[in-house]
Interface confidence: low
């Protein structure tokens, strides 16, 4: 027997409340279907029920958590349906507070080289699941270590392409509900860096300023990157502007800092819009000084 | 949809014998740590066996009142589970329910079966 | 083994009033705390697992709570239909066991 094809949009990792949409799909036509849950808590909706083309779930209650199976309509088999489709594994998030996700070194990894994510908890989730964003395959699924405050897991990710790089987060569950996830981490952009040339980094008025003085800082290329990314050492984040075609052939963007207090060694990167957690090499440092402020850093 | 149905119930003598029987239909059967427990007439809930997976080689657990003289038993295949319960008392007359475990509770329960244990 | 001692044992409330059901566990049971409701002359019905989630299909007047070795079943405006027995069961550690049995009526 021919077996349809079950897929669940937008994702098989749904937070508590939202709704997502079970689609089966026959390749032989077939668009009436029958929905079955094979383990987890039980779906009364689903019960004795055939379903057209799709079925929109929800709101979702970790009640909904578990594997999904469809089998279609079938006038040709003795049953008159389908052999079951593959399994769908719905997730639920929300069921328990967030856990923690941290990059060692840090968040921006040369290409080629290997990034730990560290996912950690003041619950002790005996389970964790990373999941990288627009991906529809299934998490991944780790093992946490306990301890007395806790629980987290080290990932060990490379070597680093723009294929892992992307924006992840960390879920984490217990072993009794292995579907029904905590809410998930913040999330972390992991950034693949060196995959093009270097821009040049440069201040106006000047690297020195005066304490409360603007200072405005131009990162520019000949190559065409749509968006420059403007970090300071020892700082998380990262600014982001985009970049604008100069009389002289170059790509620019000009970060206005505004009055500065405190200096700081400065670097740009260069990206594409296609590919926004793939970036160029970093400018060489900029350090920026401030006059008459006793910090500088 | 899900059901269990529970039979192999009835009278029985002291120090008689008796095997129940579940019949498991509507989910997977063998992905279930699979569960017996029992109410004696107008008293509460008491768990007591279990039988893991296949992955688990089967593990089974009882209750300390019915340790050995009640073996609890599945069929993957028949999507059945048992009890045999052997030296038989009065105590252990109650109403026994099959039930599968998950998310540490038991969601679904069959209507039960009662053994009454009486000379 | 872990006790669960459950209290009151029964109880009579009016409709609309709420009602709070505790039970205690004899030692932690990290969460894993499931209420069930028995109407008279049938089968247990799952309510509430793991604390506080609730049931597909339940009321949402039913809310569990607690951490530890302390749990509470709550339903915040008693209804006719709500007449029943309600045992907590810990699924923590084996052997699993149910609390003693709350039952609950109308005035």
């Known amino acids: 027997q021919d077996k349809p094809f079950l897929s669940a949009w937008p994702g098989t990792v749904v937070s508590e409340g939202q709704h997502v949409t079970l689609q089966c799909r026959s390749r032989l036509g077939f668009n009436e279907f029958s929905l079955s849950k094979e383990d987890g808590m039980p779906v009364p909706e689903l019960y004795n029920r055939i379903f057209r083309n799709s079925f929109l779930m929800g709101p979702v209650t970790p009640a909904h958590a578990g594997t999904y199976r469809c089998c279609s309509s079938h006038p040709h088999s003795p049953t008159g349906w389908s052999a079951p489709s593959n399994p769908v594994v719905i997730m639920v998030t929300g069921v328990h507070r967030k856990p923690s996700l941290l990059a060692h070194p840090g968040p921006l990894v040369k290409s080629g080289e290997t990034v730990i994510l560290q996912c950690w908890s003041d619950v002790r989730f005996e389970r964790f699941l990373l999941h990288r964003e627009g991906i529809t395959e299934d998490p991944l699924r780790l093992v946490g270590q306990l301890h007395d405050a806790g629980s987290q897991v080290n990932y060990s990710m490379g070597p680093m392409t723009p294929a892992l790089a992307g924006t992840y987060r960390c879920f984490g569950s217990v072993t009794h509900l292995p579907y029904e996830l905590s809410a998930p981490s913040d999330p972390l952009d992991i950034v693949v860096v060196g995959l093009y040339g270097k821009p040049s980094l440069s201040a106006q008025p000047g690297p020195t300023v005066q304490a409360g003085e603007n200072v405005t800082l131009s990162c520019s290329s000949r190559s065409l990157f749509d968006i420059y990314h403007l970090s300071r050492e020892a700082e998380a984040g990262e600014l982001r502007l985009t970049a604008v075609l100069r009389v002289n052939g170059t790509f620019q963007a000009n970060f206005p800092l505004g009055p500065v207090t405190h200096g700081g060694n400065y670097r740009c990167f260069g990206s594409f819009r296609a590919l926004p957690h793939a970036w160029s090499d970093p400018s060489d440092p900029l350090p920026v000084s401030v006059t008459g402020n006793s910090r500088h850093l | 949809e899900l059901q269990l149905v529970e039979s192999g119930g009835g009278l029985v003598q002291p120090g008689g014998s008796l095997r129940l029987s579940c019949a498991a239909s509507g989910f997977t059967f063998s992905n279930y740590w699979m569960n017996w427990v029992r109410q004696a007439p107008g008293k509460g809930l008491e768990w007591v066996a279990e039988?893991?997976?296949?992955?688990?080689?089967?593990?089974?657990h009882y209750a300390e009142s019915v340790k050995g003289r009640f073996t609890i038993s599945r069929d993957n295949a028949k999507n059945s589970l048992y009890l045999q319960m052997n030296s038989l008392r009065a105590e252990d007359t109650a109403v026994y329910y099959c039930?599968?475990?998950?998310?540490?509770?038991?969601?679904?329960w069959g209507q039960g079966t009662l053994v009454t244990v009486s000379s | 083994d872990i006790q669960m001692t459950q209290s009151p044992s029964s109880l009579s409330a009016s409709v609309g009033d709420r009602v709070t059901i505790t039970c205690r566990a004899s030692q932690d049971i990290s969460n894993y705390l499931n209420w069930y409701q028995q109407k008279p002359g049938k089968v247990p019905k799952l309510l509430i697992y793991?604390?506080?989630i609730l049931q597909l299909g339940v009321p949402s007047r039913f809310s569990g709570s607690g951490s530890g070795t302390d749990y509470t079943l709550t339903i915040s405006s008693l209804q006719p239909e709500d007449v029943a027995t309600y045992y907590c069961q810990q699924g923590n550690a084996l052997p699993f066991t149910f609390g003693g049995g709350t039952k609950v009526e109308i005035k």
């Open positions: 793991y604390t506080s």
């Open positions: 039988i893991r997976l296949k992955s688990n080689n089967y593990a089974t």
């Open positions: 039930t599968p475990f998950y998310g540490s509770s038991f969601p679904y």
